[in-house]
């Protein structure tokens, strides 16, 4: 009875726009094969100089690696040749072709539908486990904000297909060991922990084994707890500026804050010849502050138009939130206009700004 419904013609497919570049080709080669990748010019037109890249690093031609503008050959392939290959335009670095190459112990047998994640029988007579993408397993420390999800993966192959188990801090790790449990996907060689908490910190080891051997990988998980702090201002902003009389100037201030920040731009002024009051607080005038329709983006920029000598001086970006305040300052130097500078030079005078 369920047969008819299983074979139902599926409704229209929902198109999900994906990333650039063009679709990645998944290719599987046997150990010892020659890997040949071809990348004809798009639209058949001229291609210009190209570069071949593997896992983000440019390929260096050798006796074994033959590089041409439209073709790449890797002779006598081994596991180490597995990876992501792309052909890029040398000048723009635009990816023209992208290939996912996997080299297995078996003679090549066509496409591999589901990429690196699926468990499979490689067709090798016998074989100890090995990582299918060892270059992806270099990173071992994962720092994650609390309440997010963590996935550890150890994709492997071997014959017979190996089993995978997980340890936490060297001990067997099971779902009942954490609130919220864990999700294991043996087909994807993965362990998932949803909504992590500080007690999830520790070392997680995958153990992949069959009767011919065992391999393991240990990852360290750190769960970050957020402590509220006063706004952080980007170093170097605002920057000191030198401007010509009558020109326009912009000061920038980049504010990072958990709590909603309140941003103000201040100009330091003198009162009765003094820059600070009796209590040591500087005299300032507020140039810009949050209004009904002012966005944070707008507040992060102070624009001065048609500057005069009176605009010279010290400017401060002040950011506060419920925790406290932070401020950075910068100086504006205003120089005379070009013709005044020329006259000054002829007179032998020097302007210090």
């Amino acid at each position: 009875e369920s047969l008819g419904t299983e074979q139902r013609v599926v409704g229209r497919a929902a198109e999900v726009p994906g990333p650039e570049p063009g679709q990645q080709e998944q290719l599987v080669f046997g150990s010892g094969d020659a890997v040949e990748l071809s990348c004809p010019p798009p639209g058949g037109g001229p291609m210009g100089p190209t570069v071949w890249v593997k896992d983000g690093t440019g390929l260096v031609p050798s006796e074994r690696v033959l590089v041409g503008p439209q073709r790449l050959q890797v002779l006598n392939a081994s596991h180490e040749d597995s990876g992501a290959y792309s052909c890029r335009q040398r000048l723009t670095q635009r990816v023209l072709c992208h290939f996912s190459v996997r080299v297995t112990d078996a003679p090549s047998s066509g496409d591999d539908e589901d990429g690196e994640d699926e468990a499979e029988d490689t067709g090798v007579d016998t074989g100890a486990p090995y990582w299918t993408r060892p270059e992806r397993m270099d990173k071992k420390l994962l720092a994650v904000p609390a309440a997010n999800t963590v996935r550890f993966r150890c994709p492997a192959a071997g014959n017979p297909t190996p089993s995978i188990s997980w340890l936490k801090n060297g001990r067997e790790f099971r779902g009942e060991h954490r609130i919220g449990g864990i999700k294991l996907r043996h087909q994807q060689w993965s362990l998932v922990m949803e909504s992590v908490v500080p007690s999830d910190r520790g070392n997680y080891t995958c153990v992949v084994e069959n009767k011919f051997g065992s391999i393991r990988q240990t990852y360290t998980l750190d769960v970050l707890e957020r402590s509220p702090h006063r706004p952080i201002l980007q170093a170097g902003l605002p920057a000191n500026q030198t401007a010509v009389l009558g020109s326009d100037v912009e000061f920038h201030c980049k504010v990072y804050s958990d709590a909603q920040p309140h941003i103000q731009w201040l100009k330091h002024v003198e009162v009765n010849g003094s820059k600070v009051g009796p209590d040591g607080t500087p005299y300032v005038t507020v140039l810009k502050t949050a209004g009904a329709n002012t966005t944070d983006k707008e507040l992060e920029v102070l624009s001065l138009h048609n500057v005069t000598f009176e605009d010279a001086g010290e400017y401060t970006c002040l950011a506060g939130n419920s925790i406290g305040f932070s401020h950075h300052s910068a100086w504006l130097v205003v120089l005379p206009a070009e013709e005044e500078l020329v006259e000054a030079d002829e007179a032998g005078s020097v302007y210090a700004g």
């Epitope: 990333p19 990645q24 609390a146 997010n148 999800t149 996935r151 957020r226 958990d258």
Partner: antibody
């Protein structure tokens, strides 16, 4: 219990501004993100943007870049969507959704998932 | 598309380019907010009935409801989060036959 409540919707003229609020409760606001998603009448879902209050980082859809600004006040557990220069095509129900990351050393991207959604607030841009 | 209670329903989603397994599925009923069903192509979100399952990788993804229940009549959206901005499919409405 995780809850998100949007407010601030209403009728506004083209070129006008509106500020939507998303009050969150029941979870650690600073550890996860807040996304805004809209749905025009009778149409599908369109992602507008998201903020990670942890560091204030924001991303926006091209259709709203430069006009909309997302911010958050962690002391109030509230996210905001400031909408300026509104157009008729911005008419939609606006949803906020808690957004968490799936962190995976094996891949070179972080997958973001929207797991809890508010009830939505209707914004109508019309003269 | 019209379906009957008890049917096995398969909804497909095709990405224009490889999005690995970074695909989520949402269910939306009229006048209500979307609900997360599946993330990372095949992981059932907590509290979602086990009759829902997801599969796929690369460009082709499937949401399966093993035995359609009356409360499952809704619109289903897939969404990729491999790149920013994330994008949704146009939705598939499952109606009562």
């Amino acid at each position: 219990e995780v809850q998100l409540v949007e407010s601030g919707g209403g009728l506004v003229q083209p070129g006008g501004s509106l500020r939507l609020s998303c009050a969150a409760s029941g979870f650690t606001f600073t550890s996860t993100g807040i996304s805004w998603v809209r749905q025009a009448p009778g149409k599908g879902l369109e992602w507008v943007g998201r903020i990670y209050p942890t560091n204030g980082s924001t991303n926006y859809a091209d259709s709203v870049k430069g006009r909309f600004t997302i911010s958050a006040d962690t002391s109030k557990n509230t996210a905001y969507l400031q909408m300026n220069s509104l157009r008729a095509e911005d008419t939609a129900v606006y949803y906020c959704a808690r957004t968490y990351g799936i962190y995976d050393l094996y891949v070179d991207y972080t997958e973001y998932v929207m797991d809890y959604w508010g009830q939505g607030t209707l914004v109508t841009v019309s003269s | 598309r019209s379906e009957a209670s008890g049917d096995r329903v398969t909804i497909t989603c095709r990405a224009s380019q490889d999005v690995s397994t970074a695909v989520a599925w949402y269910q939306q009923k009229p006048g209500k907010a979307p609900k997360l069903l599946i993330y990372s192509a095949s992981f059932l979100y907590s509290g979602v009935p086990s009759r829902f399952s997801g599969s796929g990788s690369g460009t082709d993804f499937t949401l399966t409801i093993s035995s359609l229940q009356p409360e499952d009549f809704a619109t289903y959206y897939c969404q990729q989060s491999y790149t920013t901005p994330p994008t949704f499919g146009q939705g598939t409405k499952v109606e009562i036959k």
